[in-house]
């Protein structure tokens, strides 16, 4: 099959939509339910949470609540809003206006054009504060999720049916089956469909064999397929990469943990932004990459590939895509380089007959017997060799 | 009782734009939330754009964003819909609707709907 279109929503940069980038997540939460998966739905405005608006809640924003929340869909017995408002009757005419009271015009409302979370947007002051919340309960014995990837969007596809998760046999499993994995999880359109042992076999039961997405369905299950647990095994899991994963190389350094920071998103190879290309991101890199912490951060070179990638981190995550991460659609990196890194594992940092001094670090003997790079006043740091 | 009455549509070309008003007879028109729904022949009503009481929220859907606009002027008891890059599927019958309860992007919550007018997108 040919791989599927890039959905176009895709091809949005945050700044220039109402709607949800794949890097963000749906501001939402469930609260007083019997899971995570269940109770009130609240929304995130700036630094507080408040309860979704009962009377604009409909299963189109239930069916997108579930899935951002990784719940599966929504079950029909989600408590929605009645077919006739429950609500305060309209003032008599002649009464005074009463908008001006922020207790009357204060619930926000989450409200979806589609059942897909970056579909939705939380609209301010929709419904006035008349104490009817949205509720809903998930499918939460539904789900699925890719494991072993490095990432949310990478990895064994495994499903949870019956309480229980399990993989997928790779009978069949192409583009279009891994395209829909991919959308289900908010995640993209399929980069690649992967047979078995390209990740870590699972351990427990395999849920389904033969499937035959269309690639249009909206959840794996409902695919054609066969039930799993006869001529399959665990070298059989498929997986899948989507266009959301991110993974990242170095390039042009002496190793893999020097050189120019390339992150591999949608499809294609991009130089990030070193404008915001901070000691953070830069550790974080390192470590992630399994070389060691960051020594410095060289000046960049003009973008040899398209650069549209931003991150900020805060120096703890283990990955970047665990940071707050912005991709520029429209836009190259305006008036930056694209960032580089030299990693403390770089055997350029290790190797003392290599004449070259990397930018920005001075060599100093102490005693004859010790060598001493000082890195750069931004980090400030000593490393004994 | 409030009234809603609809006026500014008519016949225009592909591209072109038109101007929507909807008045109320209602004093406490500012205790409404607004609307926009429309019905093109054989097919059912559909939300267009929606504003809040006081204005400061807006919502449109998918097919009308960035080419319509949902403005009200409380002090002239008026809503607004400015259609601009207009097309053929625009073509329907407009109704301006207001909600006491909550913003009128669900039918449910509608507590009154105009009349309506005709916006027809031709060359």
């Known amino acids: 099959h040919p791989s599927p279109a890039p959905p176009d929503q895709l091809n949005t940069s945050s700044a220039e939509s109402e709607l949800w980038e794949p890097g963000e997540r749906l501001p939402v939460r469930l609260t007083n339910g019997s899971s995570s998966c269940s109770g009130t739905v609240e929304v995130r405005l700036e630094a507080s949470w408040e309860p979704a608006c009962g009377a604009l809640w409909d299963s189109r924003a239930a069916e997108a609540v579930c899935r951002a929340l990784g719940c599966g869909g929504a079950e029909a017995a989600s408590q929605l809003a009645p077919p006739t408002p429950e609500l305060p009757p309209p003032p008599a005419a002649g009464n005074t206006s009463v908008a001006a009271n922020a207790t009357l015009a204060g619930a926000p409302a989450l409200l979806c054009s589609g059942a897909e979370w970056r579909l939705c947007e939380v609209v301010e002051h929709a419904c006035r504060s008349d104490g009817r919340r949205a509720r809903v309960t998930c499918a939460e014995n539904r789900a699925l999720r890719l494991v072993d990837g490095g990432g949310a969007c990478a990895g064994r596809v495994e499903m949870l049916e019956h309480g229980e998760w399990g993989s997928v046999c790779d009978d069949t499993w192409d583009l279009e089956d891994a395209h829909v994995v991919c959308r289900q999880l908010g995640c993209g359109w399929a980069v690649q469909a992967l047979p078995g042992l390209h990740f870590t076999p699972g351990r427990g039961p395999i849920h389904r064999d033969q499937v035959n997405c269309s690639g249009a369905e909206a959840y794996l299950w409902d695919c054609p397929g066969l039930p799993g647990q006869h001529y399959c095994g665990h070298k059989e899991d498929a997986g899948a990469v989507c266009s959301e994963h991110q993974s990242w190389r170095l390039t042009g350094g002496a190793d893999r943990c020097e050189g120019q920071v390339e992150v591999h998103f949608r499809g294609v190879w991009n130089t990030v932004c070193d404008s915001e290309w901070y000691p953070s991101e830069a550790k974080v890199l390192c470590q992630s990459l399994g070389c060691g912490t960051a020594v410095e951060r060289p000046k960049g070179l003009p973008h040899s590939l398209s650069g549209r990638m931003y991150y900020s981190c805060n120096g703890e995550e283990l990955t970047l895509s665990n940071c707050s991460w912005r991709f520029n659609n429209s836009n190259l990196c305006s008036q930056s380089l694209a960032a580089r890194v030299l990693c403390s594992a770089s055997r350029s940092l290790h190797n003392l007959s290599t004449p070259e001094v990397p930018a920005s670090v001075q060599t100093v003997t102490i005693e004859s017997s010790v060598t001493v790079k000082i890195e750069n006043k931004e980090s400030r740091e000593l490393m004994l060799l | 009782q409030v009234q809603l009455v609809e006026s500014g549509g008519g016949l225009v070309q592909p591209g072109g734009s038109l101007r929507l008003s909807c008045s109320a007879s209602?004093?406490?028109?500012?205790?409404?939330?607004l609307g926009w729904f429309r019905q093109a022949p054989g097919k059912e009503r559909e939300f267009v754009a929606a504003?809040?009481?006081?204005?400061?929220?807006?919502y449109y859907a998918d097919s009308v964003k960035g080419r319509f606009t949902i403005s009200r002027d409380n002090s002239k008891n008026t809503l607004y819909l400015q259609m601009n890059s207009l097309r053929a599927e625009d073509t329907a019958v407009y109704y301006c609707?207001?909600?006491?309860?909550?913003?009128?992007?669900?039918?449910?919550?509608?507590?009154?709907w105009g009349k309506g007018t005709q916006v027809t997108v031709s060359s």
């Open positions: 504003i809040n009481w006081v204005g400061g929220s807006t």
């Open positions: 609707v207001a909600s006491w309860g909550a913003m009128p992007v669900l039918t449910h919550v509608i507590n009154y």
């Open positions: 209602e004093r406490t028109f500012s205790d409404y939330a």
